[in-house]
Interface confidence: low
């Protein structure tokens, strides 16, 4: 019977301290005279003093009140001795259970909490969780068992009982439908939380609900009907903008207009963009319209948003109709580029070619040609009929004017409308190579010994095209063969010249005679200068001196 | 460009109702919120309140028995009404609209202000 | 309601040289589900309106120059103004809008030193 039930105390007792709470006896007492002894956490080790035991009655003492939110369980050890100290019991366990007072108010973990809901959702919908604590205790007593509630709501539009919180979750969930963003995007909740489950102290905390934007208004046209005018021909021309209103918040996916053209434009002629700012529809031509084919367009034009409707919306629809205003075209060369072989050195006053233009205007203008650009000089165009002659000789070898044998033109066509426009069409003459140009040596200057003399290699060049070129024939005219040689190469594109008597020092002419594969002759005066030397030379050395 | 310009009487008896109008150009009226706020002078800034887009309100809780804001968007208006005036009252107030309708838009925040207007509450 | 408190009430800076304003709130300015601060800083010269500078806390505002700049999270804020201009001398506001009502800071006033 060396044993103690464990003891129960209140929390926060009044005292008066020490308070005696058990007595801890052993009936070892009959025999010897016993003292008694307490160890642990509260006795001898922190928190010391707590607890205490008269020595000799064995009272269990309490010296200060106890605080259950700090210690809830002391477990402490009884001892027995008898005078001369020996241990007369086992040390006994003693349990010291704090109970609990309703001292402490419930705490939110925040003093706002922030969470947000759809508009248009229906009730039922869980919005957030709001959460207090409360330091009591919540397992043997209602001390520490919180209720939550919902003490105001603000704005109370469109009443005051949008939401309700689950009494012991803590959760917020709308309770009633009619969450319209647009009307109310924010709701500000003053919540509560009561221990004792709802009868005991209170605490407050703010939570705000966000309405969330859903896609639960339609965009709708303002104007319905526009008229717009646009001159023909014209791509990329702004038509019209088309004003749209929206109720959803602006720039989300639920107000950014999308627009679609749905009926009217046959030809695809037309486009819709969306302003990313001021959410208009830009409608713009993405060809060019015709006033000769049709001078007038309606078309019809349907807007959504960009993210779907949230319920069965009705779309909203404008009308556009689109006057093609005339404009005096310019005339059109046909082709735009046109290209014509003609032979070089045609006689003056011969005929080219016809080149005209076309005027896309139904009215019967009078369309008047002129030539804009002829860089050598060479044509001239009939101002009525677009006919085009040489006045000029037309130099197939003029490489300050020709490129690749193509001699380009650009010409212009006016029309007599008011005011006047022009075209511009361009003439690419292909000129066909004639025989007018001879080969021609190069170098045509030499230096050559007079004593061993080197072969001197001279090449051929022949401006015309073949085969008006090699093979080459040369020959030596004005005497010129009785001191030199001249012979053309196997594949008959150079000639040799060599000195085949001796010449004393000085310059000479060599007259040589080139002629090309249509026989067309070109007499060159080679400049010789022979010096008194040996073999390869450069130029020729000055007079020996002795010394 | 958006601009707001309050008007209204300059002078309020005690115990009258101040009322003050705002006027919203360069942009569509409904499309943002129009908050109202107030500085007395020499002191710092004051939010009275905020109507939305839809005509849904909030107050300062400390002037909420007191305070009235509404629109009229077929005069791109809207409108103060401060009743049961003190000498307290004396302030420049401001309209000043909304960042943005949407919370990530930084609605609480003011890009645009009017000007000010001083009313004083005098007798 | 959320309190606002700046630091210093005034505070005198040399040309080009960087000022620093404080603004600390009563509970924090931080929300966890977008993890933004709902804090934004104005700029008032006298006989003028506020003008936004900052929003979220750090966001500047368009048209701004980049020498002003906002930092903090949750209860502590500052607003920086790298290289102090003749034009910078002004009362500077900051603001919640965490929860209602929206509350303001009692102003710093900027002076060139």
């Known amino acids: 019977d060396w044993v103690v039930a464990p003891i129960s105390v209140p929390e926060n007792g009044k005292g008066p301290f020490p308070q005696r709470l058990n007595q801890l006896k052993s009936n070892k007492d009959r025999d010897t005279k016993i003292f008694y002894s307490i160890t642990g956490p509260g006795a001898d080790s922190p928190p010391e003093g707590v607890f205490a035991v008269e020595k000799e009655t064995g009272w269990l003492l309490l010296n200060k009140p106890l605080d259950r939110e700090e210690i809830a369980k002391y477990e402490l050890f009884g001892h027995a001795v008898s005078e001369n100290g020996a241990s007369v019991e086992d040390p006994m366990n003693i349990s010291i259970i704090v109970t609990d007072q309703n001292d402490h108010k419930p705490k939110f973990t925040q003093d706002t909490f922030r969470g947000s809901v759809l508009e248009g959702v229906l009730p039922g919908t869980s919005v957030m969780q709001v959460t207090a604590t409360d330091e009591d205790d919540a397992i043997y007593t209602y001390n520490g068992v919180v209720a939550y509630s919902i003490h105001s709501q603000e704005p109370k539009d469109p009443h005051d009982l949008m939401f309700t919180i689950h009494r012991s979750t803590g959760t917020i969930s709308v309770i009633s439908s009619g969450l319209d963003r647009e009307k109310v995007p924010e709701y500000t909740l003053t919540i509560q939380a009561t221990d004792m489950d709802g009868d005991g102290s209170t605490t407050t905390a703010v939570a705000v609900v966000e309405i969330l934007d859903a896609n639960d208004n339609a965009p709708m046209f303002d104007p319905q009907k526009y008229e717009a005018h646009v001159p023909e021909n014209a791509v990329g021309h702004e038509v019209q903008r088309l004003t749209v209103t929206d109720l959803d918040a602006p720039n989300s996916p639920a107000w950014r207009a999308t627009y679609l053209i749905m009926g009217g434009d046959d030809g695809d002629h037309f486009t819709i963009t969306t302003h990313p700012e001021s959410n208009q529809g830009i409608l713009t031509t993405r060809k060019g319209l015709d006033f000769e084919a049709k001078n007038q367009h309606t078309l019809y034009v349907e807007v959504t948003n960009e993210a779907p409707f949230v319920l069965k919306l009705p779309t909203s629809t404008a009308t556009i109709v689109v006057h093609v205003e005339d404009v005096n075209e310019a005339p059109v060369f046909v082709p735009p580029s046109k290209v014509v072989e003609v032979q070089e050195g045609i006689p003056t006053g011969e005929p080219v070619c016809v080149y005209t233009a076309e005027d896309p205007d139904k009215e019967n203008q009078k369309i008047s040609y002129r030539i804009l650009r002829d860089p050598a000089g060479w044509l001239a165009m009939d101002p009525d009929s677009g006919q085009v002659t040489a006045v000029g000789t037309l130099d197939r070898e003029d490489e300050q004017f020709v490129r690749n044998n193509i001699y380009e033109v650009m010409v212009l066509a006016m029309d007599n409308g008011s005011p006047p426009t022009t075209g511009t069409g361009t003439l690419l003459l292909t000129l066909i190579d004639v025989n007018d140009h001879g080969p021609v040596p190069e170098p045509r200057q030499i230096t050559i010994c007079n004593q061993s003399p080197v072969r001197q290699v001279l090449n051929i060049t022949d401006k015309d095209l073949s085969p008006h070129t090699s093979p080459f024939q040369a020959q030596l005219t004005d005497d010129s063969d009785i001191y030199w040689t001249a012979e053309v190469n196997e594949e008959g594109d150079t000639v040799v010249l060599s000195l085949k008597k001796f010449l004393k020092q000085d310059t000479y002419d060599v007259h040589l005679s080139l002629s090309d594969h249509g026989n067309k002759e070109q007499l060159t005066v080679i400049r010789a200068t022979v010096c008194d030397c040996h073999g390869h030379v450069e130029t020729c050395p000055g007079p020996w001196k002795g010394g | 460009q958006v601009q707001l310009q309050e008007s209204g009487p300059g002078l309020v008896k005690p115990s009258e109702t101040l009322s003050l109008t705002c006027t919203v150009s360069?942009?569509?009226?409904?499309?943002?919120?129009i908050n109202w706020i107030r500085q007395p002078p020499g002191k710092g800034l004051e939010w009275i309140g905020v109507i939305w887009t839809g005509g849904g309100t909030n107050y300062n809780p400390s002037l909420k028995s007191r305070v009235t804001i509404s629109v009229d968007t077929s005069k791109n208006q809207f409108s103060l009404k401060l009743s049961s005036v003190t000498a307290a009252d004396t302030a420049v107030y401001y309209c000043?609209?909304?960042?943005?309708?949407?919370?990530?838009?930084?609605?609480?925040?003011?890009?645009?202000w009017g000007q000010g207007t001083l009313v004083t509450v005098s007798s | 309601d959320i309190v606002m408190t700046q630091s210093p009430d005034s505070l005198a800076v040399s040309l080009g040289e960087r000022a620093t304003i404080n603004c600390k709130s009563s509970q924090s300015l931080l929300y966890s589900s977008n993890q933004k601060n709902y804090l934004a800083w104005y700029q008032q010269k006298p006989g003028q309106p506020p003008k936004l500078l900052i929003y979220?806390?750090?966001t500047r505002e368009s048209g701004v120059p980049d020498r002003f700049s906002g930092s903090g999270s949750g209860t502590d804020f500052t607003l920086t103004i790298s290289s102090l201009q003749a034009e910078d001398v002004a009362v500077y506001y900051c603001q919640q809008y965490y929860s209602y009502p929206y509350t303001f800071g009692q102003g710093t006033k900027l002076e060139i030193k």
């Open positions: 360069g942009g569509s009226i409904t499309s943002y919120p």
């Open positions: 979220w806390a750090s």
């Open positions: 000043a609209r909304s960042r943005g309708v949407y919370d990530f838009d930084g609605r609480g925040a003011m890009d645009y």
